[in-house]
Interface confidence: low
């Protein structure tokens, strides 16, 4: 015998519900109809749905799914977005401080060099900023350019101040002599090594965060397939066709549907886990010469030492350069005059006292800890979405896609699905092209992160020892050493805890500026999730 008509024999409830989805009632039957044209909500008897309603339900179901996915990723998305912005700004602040300290060192110790030195220092740190943000600049070239530019000024201002104006066309010769005679000793090489290591790591760290944003944005804006739309419609809306307005889908059924719909997205899981673990490894290695905060904020000291090195060898150098660059001068001219204060005592720059011990490195570790709580994000998505959409508790008295059942049975539900579309097939289709692309990008960044994961055998420290620098003086639990030669290493107590300015740009520049750029991103975020402590580096 035919099944009884739906409890709502006039389709009144269905009409009023559908009115909210689609103003106008022309698609809703007044009373139950055979529904022979339906393709998704296949009726077992009279139905309150039409083909047009079914299409609208499918569209709504897919939109619902997209919104659920977006809300699922909202917290993670803002965690990475906020931190990417904060770190980018923080790195710029480190660069600005490093520039200010270097300028201050020149101002305090070598005032006669300042006009030109400020300019060269500004250019150097601009390049540093651009490099961090992905610009194709060679770090060795940056360092060479800094020392090539500084040496003629040091020579003409400090070493041979009696040089007549007519001899000032020797700049090119002096730039060449700087490298040939190694006038700054091994300091340029030391700076190259430290700066390139620390900036490389910083750059890849920012790249990784920006890729994290891209991954979330990609999965956030996935368009679900028609098959998925049909499955979702059956789960969420087909019960309405039978007038069952209050019934909820079975939890187990929801999980099956979500796993089908999210099969492609879940494929990201393996690479996402690897991404977070590789990022953690990178962050764990970001200390000493792999920490740009440590390296850049110590540059003023190393540059100061390098100029002292030149001054100590000034007599010998002046003679050699006088011969080497004689052809550039109208007559060979050397002054025996040296300013009395040539061998200036080192003045350790006063570092502004900041009470809290917060650093970028602790902020990085905090981010990793938070990211690790999202390590199963993609594999847990189907379950998360089911738990955040209406499902029946305990799988009792619930909708299984075809009918109201006392208890959900996965086997029965699957058998019922087979005659409409194959769930297994849906899983086998493989990820969307955009998902495949993002997986490729994750593979690439994971490879980069792995190759960049630092201190395996402290190779670099060994190299520095060979160059004659006493890196042995710096134990891990001592104050960090910042650059320096064997006879006068500057130590800055506790490094510089300047995070007070992290992302809160309170400029103290009094030297010529260096313009810095931010990496453009197309995405606009218009909903700001309250991140609580994520925004506050001081808790």
């Amino acid at each position: 015998q035919p099944p009884p008509p739906p409890p709502d024999a006039t389709c009144h409830q269905v009409r009023s519900f559908f009115q909210r989805l689609q103003p106008g009632l022309k698609w809703v039957p007044e009373t139950p109809v055979p529904g022979s044209d339906l393709q998704v909500c296949l009726p077992k008897g009279p139905t309150c749905c039409s083909r047009k309603m079914e299409e609208k339900y499918q569209l709504t179901a897919r939109l619902n799914m997209e919104q659920l996915l977006q809300s699922a990723s909202m917290e993670l998305k803002f965690l990475i977005i906020q931190n990417a912005a904060v770190f980018q700004e923080a790195f710029e602040i480190v660069v600005r401080h490093a520039k200010n300290y270097t300028n201050a060192m020149f101002k305090n110790n070598y005032p006669s060099l300042t006009p030109q030195a400020f300019e060269f220092v500004g250019e150097f740190f601009t390049d540093v900023s651009l490099y961090i943000l992905g610009s194709d600049i060679n770090v060795d070239d940056m360092v060479n350019e800094l020392f090539d530019s500084l040496f003629p000024v040091i020579y003409t201002q400090l070493m041979n101040p009696g040089l007549p104006d007519s001899a000032l066309d020797i700049n090119e010769c002096l730039r060449g002599a700087r490298r040939d005679l190694k006038v700054f000793g091994n300091f340029p090489k030391l700076i190259m090594t430290q700066v390139s290591k620390s900036l490389q790591v910083t750059r890849i760290f920012l790249q990784a965060l920006n890729l994290g944003i891209e991954v979330i944005n990609t999965t956030d804006h996935l368009k679900f397939s028609k098959d998925c739309g049909r499955m979702l419609t059956r789960m969420w809306y087909c019960s309405y066709c039978q007038g069952l307005m209050m019934v909820k889908p079975c939890g187990g059924y929801c999980n099956v549907v979500m796993q089908g719909c999210m099969a492609g997205v879940v494929e990201i899981d393996k690479y996402w886990r690897e991404y977070i673990l590789s990022l953690e490894e990178l962050v764990n290695g970001m200390y000493r010469i792999y920490d740009m905060e440590n390296v850049l904020l110590g540059l003023f000291s190393t540059i100061h030492d390098s100029i002292q090195y030149v001054q100590k060898n000034a007599g010998k150098l002046t003679t050699t350069i006088g011969k080497l660059c004689a052809h550039s001068q109208q007559r060979q001219y050397r002054s025996a005059y040296y300013p009395e204060d040539l061998f200036i005592d080192k003045k350790v720059l006063k570092v502004a006292h900041v009470e809290h011990e917060e650093t970028l490195s602790s902020r990085r570790r905090e981010l990793i800890q938070k990211l690790k709580s999202f390590i199963s994000f993609y594999s847990a998505l189907p379950g998360y979405i089911c738990s955040h959409s209406p499902v029946a508790e305990n799988d009792t008295l619930c909708w299984n896609g075809q009918e109201l059942v006392e208890r959900y049975s996965q086997k029965a539900a699957r058998n019922g699905m087979k005659n409409q579309f194959n769930l297994h097939e849906l899983k086998m289709k493989g990820p969307e092209p955009v998902v495949s692309q993002i997986i490729d990008k994750l593979k690439h960044i994971n490879q980069l992160l792995r190759t960049m994961s630092m201190p395996k055998g402290r190779v670099l420290d060994k190299n520095l020892d060979e160059e004659g620098f006493e890196s042995g003086d710096c134990g891990d639990d001592e104050d960090e050493c910042i650059g320096g030669s064997g006879d006068g290493m500057i130590k800055v107590k506790n490094q510089l805890r300047f995070l007070a300015e992290l992302a809160y740009d309170l400029d103290v520049d009094d030297a010529p500026g260096n313009s810095q750029q931010a990496t453009p991103k197309d995405n606009e975020i218009s909903t700001f999730h309250n991140l609580g402590n994520v925004h506050s580096p001081l808790k």
Epitope: I81, A85, V86, Q88, E89, E92, V354, E355, H356, A500, L502, A503, Y504, D505, L506, D507, G513, S515, Q516, Q517, A518, T519, P520, K521, D522, N523, E524, I525, S526, F528, N530, L531, G532, N533, V534, H535, S536, L538, K539
Partner: antibody, heavy 116, light 107 residues
């Protein structure tokens, strides 16, 4: 030096929209957040939201969602805030301010008067 | 949202005196608090942040202290030009919020 220039006043009719500007100079516009703050005698200072011009990311105070829209034009180093469906409640001084937390630099403010 | 409460709407003081303006946060904001001064017809000016660091150019008679939920701005040796509104602000979490302000009046 850092400067944020805002027009002095805007008179608008109820129900209309207004788009106010904040022209930045003296620093790299794309490197810093630009925040917007509303001040009324009754409500005091209220944070509306912020935009990071470098990548266009915006964040809003829930209270001003749908009311305010923040944009930035990198080429002219100008940040904009559009207020829609204006009512007398929107009459206030609106400031742009630069920074990530404390605001070290503020514009002079734009007085918006909503009146028929 | 975090509510910043400045319990005194007005405070009266004399030139040369010392005055303390207080601000209470509805939840722990660490040390992410700033103080601003605003004179009639002008935009606010940053005085103190984190919450004891003086901004460039701010006279050293202005000092800030506190952490967690209780914060204080102290002006020692008050000058007539200090007559203004003073606001606290938290930047620990979005949305950033301000206190309602304390108007400093000179007797």
């Amino acid at each position: 030096q850092v400067q944020l220039q805002q027009p002095g006043a805007e008179l608008v009719k109820p129900g209309a929209s207004v788009k106010m500007s904040c022209k930045a100079s003296g620093y790299t516009f794309t490197s810093y957040n630009m925040h917007w703050v509303k001040q009324t005698p009754g409500q005091g200072l209220e944070w509306i939201g912020a935009i990071y011009p470098g990548n266009g990311y915006t964040s809003y105070n829930q209270k001003f969602k749908g009311k305010a829209t923040l944009t930035a034009d990198k080429s002219s180093s100008t940040a904009y805030m559009q207020l829609s469906s204006l009512t007398s409640e929107d009459s206030a001084v609106y400031y742009c301010a630069r920074g990530g937390g404390p605001f070290a630099y503020w514009g002079q403010g734009t007085l918006v008067t909503v009146s028929a | 949202d975090i509510v910043m409460t400045q319990s005194h709407k007005f405070m009266s003081t004399s030139v040369g005196d010392r005055v303390s303006i207080t601000c209470k946060a509805s939840q722990d904001v660490g040390t992410a608090v700033a103080w601003y001064q605003q004179k009639p017809g002008q935009s606010p000016k940053l005085l103190i942040y984190w919450p004891s660091t003086r901004h460039t150019g701010v006279p050293d008679r202005f000092t800030g202290s506190g952490s967690g939920t209780d914060f204080t701005l102290t002006i020692s040796n008050v000058q007539s030009e200090d007559l203004a509104d003073y606001f606290c602000q938290q930047y620990s979490s979005y949305p950033f919020t301000f206190g309602s302000g304390t108007k400093l009046e000179i007797k």
